[in-house]
């Protein structure tokens, strides 16, 4: 099976114990590294930060002691914005300066692949966004030709059934990606106003439409029926909940919220907490199991996080071995305990050892 | 073997102008970002500018900002510093050096530039 | 801008020695920062980076260590040809700055 893990080039910015730099990574956790993200400048694939060519180099420093590991470097992004992708996705001149750059820059840089974040097409990009990876593809085997290794290239999909129908044509992009990052989780935010475990495994109880969709179990089936072979197919799992500020003395699942909660400590994003610093809310807090969705959350006083245990990934990684998927994708690698000093296990990377034990258990 | 050669040195007036460049070899020149670094007479190192390898964005030292310029040519393997409105405080020998990220890996021998009346 | 103060400005040292060389930001640079060694008339080489790596070809007696605002470099024991001045740098953000510099020599 492979085991996908993201790296975010902006976790080295976290203060103190926080901070997570490449070298801080285990070589032999997971199968593939993807670093996030690439910007794309002129055209060409280029460095977000200056000083990422530095953490590229730390990184891929890592297959020197396993040649097995495979590295790729992510594209795109949230801040990149799908405006950008578009325009250049677009224009067949733009996507051929833009493909033609690529393979040069991830051979100078160590990597063994790129892959696509394009968050997300629209409903007019869907076509372009065929093109372009249909000519990626075709870039990568040509430049392979002198008897390099390929080049591999994947792609991180949203598990939305909206942005499904409206941004991909499955069937046509799987034909070209070695696989397919479905990311099964940002399900349910404080958008709702409502507490709500942000990746359940399976449709909660009092889920009606459009919640019947929001869950891996719909999102990957989803993905099958429209022509994903299970074989290129990696499902996401979060080493991050998501936090709401509850709006009454109700605590459970579907209560009333004010908006997301509070920021972490290290993380400093309302609404979202890395397992690390969930570990330390958890003492003096309450954890409760959704029974159904096998799912855990944890409250404390207004605070209400929804996330994922060893517990949960087992069953996750159970689900994917069931459904013959290709493996698991992890984000972020970075945001699991990667010191072990915050879980209490003495134990680095506590959730994604978890995955990868439960992946080859047999 | 990486080889950066800088050339375009000499002596100028103050207000004058002064393009320095400098021809690379030895690695792909649009995939790393290239510095300019200076050392004025037994003085210290002073970054002057850099500039990404796509050419996308370029960064300056307050001192020279709004007077030197950083370009880069990919075809052509080159890099260069447009100094305008030079001072008697510009005088240094001008090291163009290849940036790994945040540190500079490779350094060129320096062209001297000398502002003087 | 972000200060690099070197200590001390100069030092002697005799062949054998354990030199320690620090640094210090004028605010957190994480591990951004870098060690350079430059002999007269040359063009100055890289030692270190990020802190602690050891660049390519340099010599193992060259260490560095730190972060956030407090950097050494520490040369185990001293070489005949380790007499030179040495800049750290920080590349945490632009712009970059290096230290005054520390110059090594021959007691």
């Known amino acids: 099976y492979k085991l996908v893990c993201y790296y975010t080039s902006w976790s080295q910015y976290r203060e103190g114990d926080g901070s997570c730099f490449p070298d801080a990574l285990d070589r032999f956790l997971c199968t593939h590294i993807i670093y996030s993200f690439a910007n794309i400048s002129n055209d060409h694939i280029d460095t977000w930060e200056w000083n990422d060519v530095t953490l590229y180099g730390m990184l891929n420093t890592l297959k020197n002691r396993n040649p097995n590991l495979k590295t790729l470097l992510s594209v795109g992004g949230w801040n990149f914005g799908s405006q950008r992708f578009s325009k250049i996705a677009s224009n067949t001149q733009s996507r051929r300066t833009f493909i033609k750059s690529v393979p040069p820059f991830l051979r100078t840089h160590g990597f063994d692949g790129l892959d696509l974040a394009w968050l997300y097409p629209g409903r007019r990009d869907k076509q372009h966004f065929t093109t372009l990876i249909k000519e990626m593809k075709a870039e990568f085997i040509k430049e392979a030709q002198p008897g390099k290794k390929q080049l591999l290239l994947s792609a991180a999909l949203s598990a939305g059934k909206v942005t499904i129908d409206s941004s991909y044509d499955i069937a046509k992009i799987s034909q070209h990606l070695d696989f397919i990052s479905i990311m099964t989780y940002d399900f349910h935010g404080a958008w709702r106003g409502t507490t709500g475990h942000h990746s359940p495994l399976f449709r909660g109880q009092e889920d009606a439409s459009p919640d019947r969709f929001s869950n891996t179990d719909y999102a990957v089936g989803y993905m099958l029926r429209l022509g994903a072979p299970a074989s290129k197919l990696v499902m996401g799992i979060p080493t991050f909940g998501r936090s709401f500020t509850l709006a009454s003395s109700e605590t459970g699942v579907g209560a009333p919220i004010s908006g997301p909660g509070i920021p972490g400590r290290f993380t400093k994003e309302a609404g979202t907490l890395a397992y690390y610093e969930i570990c330390d809310f958890l003492r003096g807090a309450t954890v409760h199991r959704i029974l159904g969705q096998q799912v855990p959350y944890a409250t404390k006083g207004n605070q209400w996080v929804g996330y994922d245990d060893q517990e949960s990934v087992k069953s996750k990684v159970q689900y994917l071995k069931d459904r013959q998927l290709a493996g698991a994708m992890v984000w972020a690698l970075d945001l699991d305990d990667f010191q072990g000093s915050f879980c209490g296990q003495d134990l680095r990377f506590p959730l994604t050892n978890a995955i990868k034990d439960a992946l080859a258990a047999t | 073997e990486v080889q950066l050669v800088e050339s375009g040195g000499g002596l100028v007036q103050p207000g004058g102008s002064l393009r320095l460049s400098c021809a690379a070899s030895?690695?792909?020149?649009?995939?790393?970002?290239m510095s300019w670094v200076r050392q004025a007479p037994g003085k210290g190192l002073e970054w002057v500018s850099a500039?990404?390898?796509?050419?996308?964005?370029?960064y300056y030292a307050d001192s020279v900002k709004g007077r030197f310029t950083i370009s880069r040519d990919n075809s052509k393997n080159t890099l260069y510093l447009q100094m305008n409105s030079l001072r008697a405080e510009d005088t240094a020998v001008y090291y163009c050096?290849?940036?790994?990220?945040?540190?500079?890996?490779?350094w060129g021998q320096g062209t001297l530039v000398t502002v003087s009346s | 801008d972000i200060q690099m103060t070197q200590s001390p400005s100069s030092l002697s040292a005799s062949v054998g020695d354990r030199v320690t060389i620090t640094c210090r930001a004028s605010?957190?640079?994480?591990?951004?920062l870098n060690w350079y060694q430059q002999k007269p008339g040359k063009a100055p080489k890289l030692l270190i980076y990020?802190?602690?790596t050891l660049q390519s070809g340099v010599p193992s007696r060259f260490s560095g260590s730190g972060s956030g605002t407090d950097f050494t470099l520490t040369i185990s024991s001293l070489q005949p040809e380790d007499f030179a001045t040495y800049y750290c740098?920080?590349?945490?953000?632009?712009?970059?700055?290096f230290g005054q510099g520390t110059k090594v020599e021959i007691k």
């Open positions: 050096a290849k940036t790994y990220g945040g540190e500079i890996d490779y």
């Open positions: 030895g690695f792909t020149f649009s995939s790393y970002g």
């Open positions: 500039i990404k390898g796509s050419g996308g964005s370029t």
């Open positions: 605010q957190s640079i994480s591990r951004w």
């Open positions: 990020a802190t602690s």
């Open positions: 740098q920080q590349s945490y953000s632009f712009p970059w700055t």
